[in-house]
Amino acid sequence: GSTAIGMKETAAAKFERQHMDSPDLGTGGGSGIEGRGSMGYRGSEDLPQLGDLAVSEVGWDGLRLNWTAADNAYEHFVIQVQEVNKVEAAQNLTLPGSLRAVDIPGLEAATPYRVSIYGVIRGYRTPVLSAEASTASGLNDIFEAQKIEWHEGTHHHHHH
């Protein structure tokens, strides 16, 4: 069996507590890409494949995922987040098929994570997309992030 990430509250539990009862299920769009996903081709498939996966920092203990996918095709998305050096410590999230972005809180600071995602269409899994990214290293990173956010806000433009 696999064990949960060793922290006060698992990422999946924290995510669910924060988002699962709210209508705007983590739909924020992110910038500042830290990791890019390549298509994890798994043989010939007759299902549409996910497009691109981007992972960026959110604060010191979170990651933001953005992905592209055909509209109205997906029943669910399933996401796995695991520390790169801890194969057994994985968290899974199952999300509605309408989402194209999600924030994942409750991770360890300054830690590399591998993020994987697939979609479910007509009851079958699509190929897996994966990317690697690290959470921020602490207060300096948060301060920088806030500075950039303020700067972007006052000049009304965003970097993508």
């Epitope: 696999s2 698992t10 669910e16 043989g43 498939e45 399933v78 999230l93 199952t94 009851g123 899994r125």
Partner: antibody, heavy 118, light 108 residues
Framework: QVQLVQSGAEVKKPGSSVKVSCKAS????????ISWVRQAPGQGLEWMGG????????NYAQKFQGRVTITADKSTSTAYMELSSLRSEDTAVYYC???????????WGQGTTVTVSS | DIQMTQSPSTLSASVGDRVTITCRAS??????LAWYQQKPGKAPKLLIY???SLESGVPSRFSGSGSGTEFTLTISSLQPDDFATYYC??????????FGQGTKVEIK
């Protein structure tokens, strides 16, 4: 560490229904998939269907479509499998199991024996 | 539903033998395949997922390979504890899917 505890053995009459429960502890119940698998005496494993508790949506194997209903109660972290129109061939051990990211069933309940006999 | 066919249905082997079990899918399932070990009166135990990924705590003598429609489970050097029944399962279906009919590994 995830643990799945199932309800006790059942003896049922042909034509009746049975409802087996599976209580989960550890991990985040709503976010993972629960499958139901059965095994008749001396036979192999049969996947019956599964559910994602967070959405309540279930998928079923064709063989059991229309006769099985899988549900989940997030408030009690419990999944249920109800099989109707029981016949003697439904005598089996019924297991619940948790699926990992790739669909492999990594944690299993202890099994519930259902005997269908007149 | 996708059909899974395992061979052989019974395999007689000795301790130390290299054992290979084959599983064939009725259509391509990419690498969405798991292998299980089951002993009498016990729940199955996950050995391999994603066709070739070893489940945590499973001895490295177990390995899986294949993609598409043809898959194999190999036990590099059979141990006394390995005499059991082995099942493959396709996981292209969500959240899980059909099993093969099983392969019983018995003492020669």
């Amino acid at each position: 560490q995830v643990q799945l505890v199932q309800s006790g053995a059942e003896v049922k009459k042909p034509g009746s229904s049975v409802k087996v429960s599976c209580k989960a502890s550890g991990g985040t119940f709503s976010s993972y998939a629960i499958s139901w698998v059965r095994q008749a005496p001396g036979q192999g494993l049969e996947w019956m269907g599964g559910i994602i508790p967070i959405f309540g949506t279930a998928n079923y194997a064709q063989k059991f479509q229309g006769r099985v209903t899988i549900t989940a109660d997030k408030s009690t972290s419990t999944a249920y499998m109800e099989l109707s129109s029981l016949r003697s061939e439904d005598t089996a051990v019924y297991y619940c199991a948790k699926g990992n990211f790739y669909g492999g069933l990594d944690y299993w309940g202890q099994g519930t024996t259902v005997t269908v006999s007149s | 539903d996708i059909q899974m066919t395992q061979s052989p249905s019974t395999l007689s082997a000795s301790v130390g033998d290299r054992v290979t079990i084959t599983c064939r899918a009725s259509q391509s399932i990419s690498s969405w395949l798991a292998w299980y070990q089951q002993k009498p009166g016990k729940a199955p135990k996950l050995l391999i997922y994603d066709a070739s990924s070893l489940e945590s705590g499973v001895p490295s003598r177990f390995s899986g390979s294949g993609s598409g429609t043809e898959f194999t489970l190999t036990i590099s050097s059979l141990q006394p504890d390995d005499f059991a029944t082995y099942y493959c399962q396709q996981n292209k279906k969500f959240p899980s899917g059909t099993f093969g009919q099983g392969t019983k590994v018995e003492i020669k």
